[in-house]
C-alpha cells in the first residue's frame, strides 16, 4: 500500500475558497491534520510558498488532472495517495458551499476524509469511519476518529512515538577525555553531531556541554552495528550510513524501505570493499568518499559518480595522509578524524588549519 516514507510532511494551501475567511480555512486544515498527527508519529508543517508534499486547492470543473469536478453536490473533493508531484494532493470542488457549520458542506469533515487519502487510506465500508465514502454531518467540536480509522492509519505509520529513549544528558566522564578514542563515523544529523562507535553512538548539540549516548539498534533496529561511514544531506533530511558493501538511507530519522543497497549502485568499482569515511559538502553538492589512499567524488544532483575518480587523497587534500576514520562537515570546514586526532581542513584554501584531539567536541 502507498504511504509516506517520512515522518515530517509539509502542506500548502495553494488557494482559498471565497466561502470562508482565510484564517478559518487555515485553522480548519491545521485541526484536520492534527486529527491524524494525534494518532501517528506524523508531523505536519504549513508552507506559504513552493511545492509541499500535500498541496491543497479549491477548483471548479477541469483543474489539471483527469478528475473533473461535477458542480454542486455529487463529488465534493478528491485526493491522491502519497508520492511525489500531484500524489498526496487534495482538491476541493469550489462549486460546493464550504462552511464550518452544519450548513452547506463542512470543510473540516471533508478535509479529514481527504487527508486520510493523502496519507494512504482507502475508503472504508464502516459507516462510523471518517473514510466512509458518503458525506454526513458530525459536530466538529466533538469529532473523534473511529477505532477502525485509528487501526488503519496506524497499520501504515504506527502509533505516536516519544523521541527515542536516549540516556540522560551528562558531561563526559573524565576517563572519556583521557582515552585515546577513535570514531567509526561522524556526521551532523540536523543540529546534532553523531559520533558512531561499534554498536552505539554519542550525540550532542555543538556548544552544549551535554553528551548523550544510545545504541544504534534502539533507535534503528534495522541498522547494523559497526557503521563505517556516514553523511547527511540536511536540505533533504537524509542520512546515509555505510558498512562494508552496503548502505542505508535514513529519511527524517526513519529508515527507508528497500535498503540496504549495494555501494556499487553509486558507481564504485568492484575493488572497493568498504568506505572508510564520507562527507557531503553542501556548497559543492558533492559527496567525498574516502577509500584507503584514494577518494571518490559523487554528484548528488546528477546522482552519478564524477568522472576521473578515484584520485589520491595526498595529492588533492594537502596535509592529509591516509588512512581516514571519519569526516565531518561543520561550518564550512572538514574535520578529518584519524585515530585519537582530527584535522580541521579548509576546503576553500585546501589546507589544514588545526590539529585537535578527536574528543575535543566533548569539552575535553
Amino acid at each position: 500500500r502507498s504511504r509516506w516514507m517520512k515522518r515530517y510532511l509539509t502542506y500548502r494551501i495553494y488557494n482559498y475558497t471565497p466561502d470562508m475567511k482565510r484564517e478559518d480555512v487555515d485553522y480548519i486544515f491545521q485541526k484536520a491534520f492534527q486529527v491524524w498527527s494525534d494518532v501517528t508519529p506524523l508531523r505536519f508543517r504549513k508552507l506559504h510558498k513552493d511545492e509541499a508534499d500535500i498541496m491543497i486547492l479549491f477548483a471548479f470543473g477541469a483543474h489539471g488532472d483527469f478528475n473533473y469536478f461535477d458542480g454542486k453536490g455529487g463529488t465534493l473533493a478528491h485526493a491522491f495517495y502519497p508520492g511525489p508531484g500531484i500524489q498526496g494532493d487534495a482538491h476541493f470542488d469550489e462549486a460546493e458551499t464550504w462552511t464550518k457549520s452544519f450548513q452547506g458542506t463542512n470543510l473540516f469533515l471533508v478535509a479529514v476524509h481527504e487527508l486520510g487519502h493523502s496519507l494512504g487510506l482507502q475508503h472504508s465500508n464502516n459507516p462510523k469511519s471518517i473514510m466512509y465514502p458518503t458525506y454526513r454531518y458530525l459536530n466538529p467540536s466533538t469529532f473523534r476518529l473511529s477505532a477502525d480509522d485509528i487501526r488503519n492509519i496506524q497499520s501504515l505509520y504506527g502509533a505516536p512515538v516519544k523521541p527515542p529513549s536516549l540516556t540522560k544528558p551528562s558531561s563526559p566522564p573524565s576517563t572519556f577525555c583521557h582515552q585515546s578514542l577513535s570514531f567509526d563515523a561522524v556526521t551532523t544529523v540536523g543540529e546534532k553531531i553523531f559520533f558512531f562507535k561499534d554498536w552505539f553512538f554519542w550525540w550532542k548539540l555543538p556548544g552544549s556541554p551535554a553528551t548523550n549516548i544510545t545504541s544504534i539498534s534502539s533507535i534503528w533496529p534495522s541498522i547494523p552495528s559497526g557503521i563505517q561511514a556516514a553523511y547527511e544531506i540536511e536540505s533533504r533530511n537524509q542520512l546515509f550510513l555505510f558498512k562494508d558493501e552496503k548502505y542505508w538511507l535514513i529519511n527524517n530519522l526513519v529508515p527507508e524501505p528497500h535498503y540496504p543497497r549495494s555501494i556499487y549502485s553509486l558507481g564504485f568499482s568492484a575493488s572497493v570493499k568498504k568506505v572508510d569515511a564520507a562527507v557531503f559538502d553542501p556548497l559543492r553538492q558533492k559527496v567525498y568518499f574516502f577509500v584507503d589512499k584514494h577518494y571518490w567524488r559523487y554528484d548528488v544532483r546528477q546522482e552519478l559518480m564524477d568522472p576521473a575518480y578515484p584520485k589520491l587523497i595526498s595529492t588533492h587534500f594537502p596535509g592529509i595522509k591516509p588512512k581516514i576514520d571519519a569526516v565531518l562537515y561543520f561550518k564550512r570546514h572538514y574535520y578529518i578524524f584519524q585515530g585519537a586526532y582530527q584535522l580541521e581542513y579548509d576546503p576553500l584554501f585546501r589546507r589544514v588549519t588545526k590539529t585537535l584531539k578527536s574528543t575535543s567536541w566533548f569539552g575535553c
Epitope: 502507498s2 495553494y14 511545492e51 498541496m55 486547492l57 477548483a59 477541469a62 483543474h63 489539471g64 488532472d65 483527469f66 478528475n67 478528491h78 485526493a79 491522491f80 495517495y81 508520492g83 511525489p84 508531484g85 500531484i86 500524489q87 487519502h117 482507502q122 475508503h123
Partner: antibody, heavy 122, light 103 residues
Framework: EVQLLESGGGLVQPGGSLRLSCAAS????????MHWVRQAPGKGLEWVSG????????MYADSVKGRFTISRDNSKNTLYLQMNSLRAEDTAVYYC???????????????WGRGTLVTVSS | DIQMTQSPSSLSASVGDRVTITCRAN??????LNWYQQKPGKAPELLIY???SLQSGVPSRFSGSGSGTDFTLTISSLQPEDFATYYC?????FGQGTKLEIK
C-alpha cells in the same frame, strides 16, 4: 527495473480490428493506473485511453470513444487495447504508459514502453 | 476544456546555449504540468513533473518553473544529447511539441 513491452501492432484495413497488448514487469502492476498514448508519423503525442488499477474505471479520448476498449488482466500483468472500426487517422505508434497508484489518475506518465506501430491502410 | 499551447514549435541552438521553452494553459492548472523529452524513434521520457520537480536520473541542467497558466522548461547549458523534441502535458492534453535542433 520497470519494463513495458507493447505488441500486437501491424497493418490492418480501414474498418478492421486489432488488439494491442502491453506486458508489464518490475512493479506491482495491480496498483497503478495505466494508459495508451499514440503518435501519428511525424506528429505529436495524443492521449488515447486510461484504466484504473482494478479495471473498474476507464477513460477515452473523444476521437476513439465507442471504437476502442481498454482493459487489463492483473493476474497476467498485461494491459490491452481493443481497436475496432479502425480509420486511416488511427495510424500511429501506440505506447503504453504507467501513471500513479490510487483511486484517481494524474496523467503522470513516468514509464513508457517502446511502442508498437499500427498502420491502417487499404 | 483545457488546452495547452507550446512555443516555439521549433528552435535552433548550439551546444552550451541556454534554452527556454514555454507552455501556456487556457485556464489554471495550478502546478500540474509535466515535461517530456523524445528522441527520434524512441519513447518519450519524463523530465519534469509538477511544474518544477526533476524526475530521478534527469541531469540538473534541466529545470521547470511556473504555476497557474504559464510554464517554462529551461536547459541551462545545452549538451549534444539534448537535441530532441520536448512536450508539455497535463492529464490527457499534450502541447504540440518543440523540436530543438542544432544550429
Amino acid at each position: 527495473e520497470v519494463q513495458l513491452l507493447e505488441s500486437g501492432g501491424g497493418l490492418v484495413q480501414p474498418g478492421g480490428s486489432l488488439r494491442l497488448s502491453c506486458a508489464a514487469s518490475g512493479f506491482t502492476f495491480s496498483w497503478y493506473w495505466m494508459h495508451w498514448v499514440r503518435q501519428a508519423p511525424g506528429k505529436g503525442l495524443e492521449w488515447v485511453s486510461g484504466i484504473s488499477p482494478s479495471g473498474g474505471m476507464t477513460m477515452y479520448a473523444d476521437s476513439v470513444k465507442g471504437r476502442f476498449t481498454i482493459s487489463r488482466d492483473n493476474s497476467k500483468n498485461t494491459l490491452y487495447l481493443q481497436m475496432n472500426s479502425l480509420r486511416a487517422e488511427d495510424t500511429a505508434v501506440y505506447y503504453c504508459a504507467r501513471d500513479i497508484v490510487g483511486p484517481y489518475s494524474a496523467g503522470l506518465f513516468d514509464y513508457w514502453g517502446r511502442g508498437t506501430l499500427v498502420t491502417v491502410s487499404s | 476544456d483545457i488546452q495547452m499551447t507550446q512555443s516555439p514549435s521549433s528552435l535552433s541552438a548550439s551546444v552550451g546555449d541556454r534554452v527556454t521553452i514555454t507552455c501556456r494553459a487556457n485556464q489554471s492548472i495550478y502546478t500540474y504540468l509535466n515535461w517530456y523529452q523524445q528522441k527520434p524513434g524512441k519513447a518519450p521520457e519524463l523530465l519534469i513533473y509538477a511544474a518544477s520537480s526533476l524526475q530521478s536520473g534527469v541531469p540538473s541542467r534541466f529545470s521547470g518553473s511556473g504555476s497557474g497558466t504559464d510554464f517554462t522548461l529551461t536547459i541551462s547549458s545545452l549538451q549534444p544529447e539534448d537535441f530532441a523534441t520536448y512536450y508539455c502535458q497535463q492529464a490527457g492534453i499534450f502541447g504540440q511539441g518543440t523540436k530543438l535542433e542544432i544550429k
